[in-house]
Interface confidence: low
């Protein structure tokens, strides 16, 4: 006697998130009469996905017309697949009765969902650091499946090697997240530099996603100070120059002190950028030599980006 078989021809089906998945199922006999139902998983906790008999399944449509008396194709199409749809689906034949009796199950089709990773988000250190220091950048991307993923770091197009990467969770999941921390040694030339986190995944068809961070947000380049005296003018005034060079960011306050007393305070603003992204600033102070009996100690005091002030002093000689 020919026995009813429920055939699910594909052991596995892989679908990209957002697409539709077709799960094929064929029954080899119209007898006995009774509905087909689709479940995800097995045992008492299995989830009903579709029933010919009853219920509302907005994302599921039968491939063939189930009202046809001679229909033996019980394939379904699930629309707008998400990673949460991953699992093993079973096509199950029931014998009509009160209640219906489970008769035969297909071998199951494992649905895996190829979900693209989210755009990598790169975050840098909370506080700025100076050249020669190592700073950490973190890259995160979420929601991808399958778990296999490749992450690379670049600085100005050059691949970095000092980084640690974790993919979570470690076990089986509908989707995964990746987090990577790269250590980057800063140089004074890094104001215009970028770090790039590049994520490659099967869903991206060879086109990696990139997240970027500008090192300008992470670096502080402290200024060089130089105080010089120009030759004395005919009116007994001496021009003293304080050159503040190669600093970043622009946030800088300069104070002139004459013999320890504040003479003038200036704030840097709208400075032209050097080729390397740093800034230069020159401040002048005119000292009336005839107003002084003794040598004048001039101090150029620079407070850069909230850091402790840096001083450079210069003595203006007053001839007897």
């Amino acid at each position: 006697e020919e026995e009813l078989q429920v055939i699910q021809p594909e052991k596995s089906v892989s679908v990209a998130a957002g697409e539709s998945a077709t799960l094929n199922c064929t029954a080899t006999s119209l007898i006995p009469v009774g509905p087909i139902q689709w479940f995800r998983g097995v045992g008492p906790g299995r989830e009903l996905i579709y029933s010919q008999k009853e219920g509302h399944f907005p994302r599921v449509t039968p491939v063939s017309d189930p009202t046809k008396r001679n229909n033996m194709d019980f394939s379904i199409r699930i629309s707008n697949i998400t990673p949460a749809d991953a699992g093993t689906y079973y096509c199950v034949k029931f014998r009509k009765g009160s209640p219906d009796v489970e008769l035969k199950s297909g071998a199951g089709t494992e649905l895996s969902v190829r979900a693209k990773p989210s755009a990598p988000v790169v975050s840098g250190p909370a506080v700025r650091a100076t050249a020669e220091h190592t700073v950490s950048f973190t890259c995160e991307s979420h929601g991808f499946s399958p778990r296999d993923i490749t992450l690379k770091w670049f600085k100005n197009g050059n691949e970095l090697s000092d980084f640690q990467t974790n993919v979570d969770p470690a076990g089986k999941s509908v989707s995964y997240s990746i987090r990577s921390t790269a250590r980057v040694v800063l140089t004074r030339r890094d104001v215009h530099s970028q770090v790039i986190c590049e994520v490659a995944h099967v869903t991206l068809q060879g086109d990696p996603l990139r997240g970027t961070a500008n090192l300008s947000e992470a670096i502080r380049v402290p200024p060089f100070l130089e105080v010089t005296q120009q030759s004395m003018r005919a009116d007994n005034q001496v021009n003293v120059t304080c050159q503040v060079t190669k600093f970043y960011p622009q946030r800088l306050q300069l104070t002139w002190l004459e013999n320890g007393n504040v003479s003038r305070t200036e704030m840097a603003s709208a400075l032209p950028e050097n080729k390397d992204g740093t800034y230069n600033w020159t401040s002048w102070l005119l000292v009336n030599v005839s107003a002084h009996r003794d040598d004048v100690k001039l101090t150029c005091q620079v407070e850069h980006d909230g850091q402790p002030a840096v001083n450079k002093s210069f003595s203006v000689k007053v001839s007897a």
């Epitope: 100005n156 197009g157 050059n158 970028q194 060879g206 086109d207 970027t212």
Partner: antibody, heavy 119, light 107 residues
């Protein structure tokens, strides 16, 4: 600064292979910008991206041309090349090579070379 | 492939006019969009990268904005030397694709 110069025959017979070379001067093909692209423009039409190559040799081709395209790099000569096989009159176009920086778009282009496919 | 729809395909404006070109992507491309200028017989020239950043040496009358699927390119005050065809280009997904171009002429 970096400059690009396309070279190759201006006339190719149908069914033959179109071969063009882009010479990079003023900088190394191996450093800085990782992508080196070929783009073409049919007469009086818009721009069509053909594909790119990393200095490492990794390539990606436009699926519309993938079966016929090969892009290769010769770092010793500071050049990268385009080969397009089984050409037809529809491949008549101005072919450009360009540098694609990580975040600067295609910021350096060759002046373009006109290739006519005709017997 | 991502489709890039540029409009208008051509426009005519007077010197000093504000000119606006739009570019629409067939799906979200974040801000991965460049704008190019191509003068007759010349290679394209990068004007704007990452949707809104001005390329080196490009006059400030050129600007770009937008994110996701809708982008705008603006010339704040049209100059005679701006006669050209302008293209948008997405680089969010391979293959990279260009808009059909907008030809800008002087009235």
């Amino acid at each position: 600064q970096v400059q690009l110069q396309e070279s190759g025959p201006g006339l190719v017979k149908p069914s033959q292979t179109l071969s063009l070379t882009c010479t990079v001067s003023g900088g190394s093909i191996s450093s800085g910008s990782p992508y080196w692209s070929w783009i073409r423009q049919h007469p009086g039409k818009g721009l069509e991206w053909i594909g790119y190559i990393y200095a490492s040799g990794f390539t990606y081709y436009n699926p519309s041309l993938k079966s016929r395209v090969t892009i290769s790099v010769d770092t010793s000569k500071n050049q990268f090349s385009l080969k397009l096989s089984s050409v037809t009159a529809a491949d008549t176009a101005v072919y450009y090579c360009a540098r694609e920086g990580y975040h600067s778009g295609m910021d350096v282009w060759g002046q373009g070379t006109t290739v006519t496919v005709s017997s | 492939d991502i489709q890039m729809t540029q409009s208008p395909s051509s426009l005519s404006a007077s010197v000093g006019d504000r000119v606006t070109i739009t570019c629409q992507a067939s799906q979200d491309i974040s801000n991965y969009l460049n704008w190019y200028q191509q003068k007759p017989g010349k290679a394209p020239k990068l004007l704007i990268y990452d949707a809104s950043n001005l390329a080196t040496g490009v006059p400030s009358r050129f600007s770009g904005s937008g994110s996701g699927t809708d982008f705008t390119f603006t010339i704040s005050s049209l100059q005679p030397e701006d006669i050209a065809t302008y293209y948008c280009q997405q680089f969010a997904y391979l293959p990279w694709t260009f808009g059909g171009g907008t030809k800008v002429e002087i009235k």
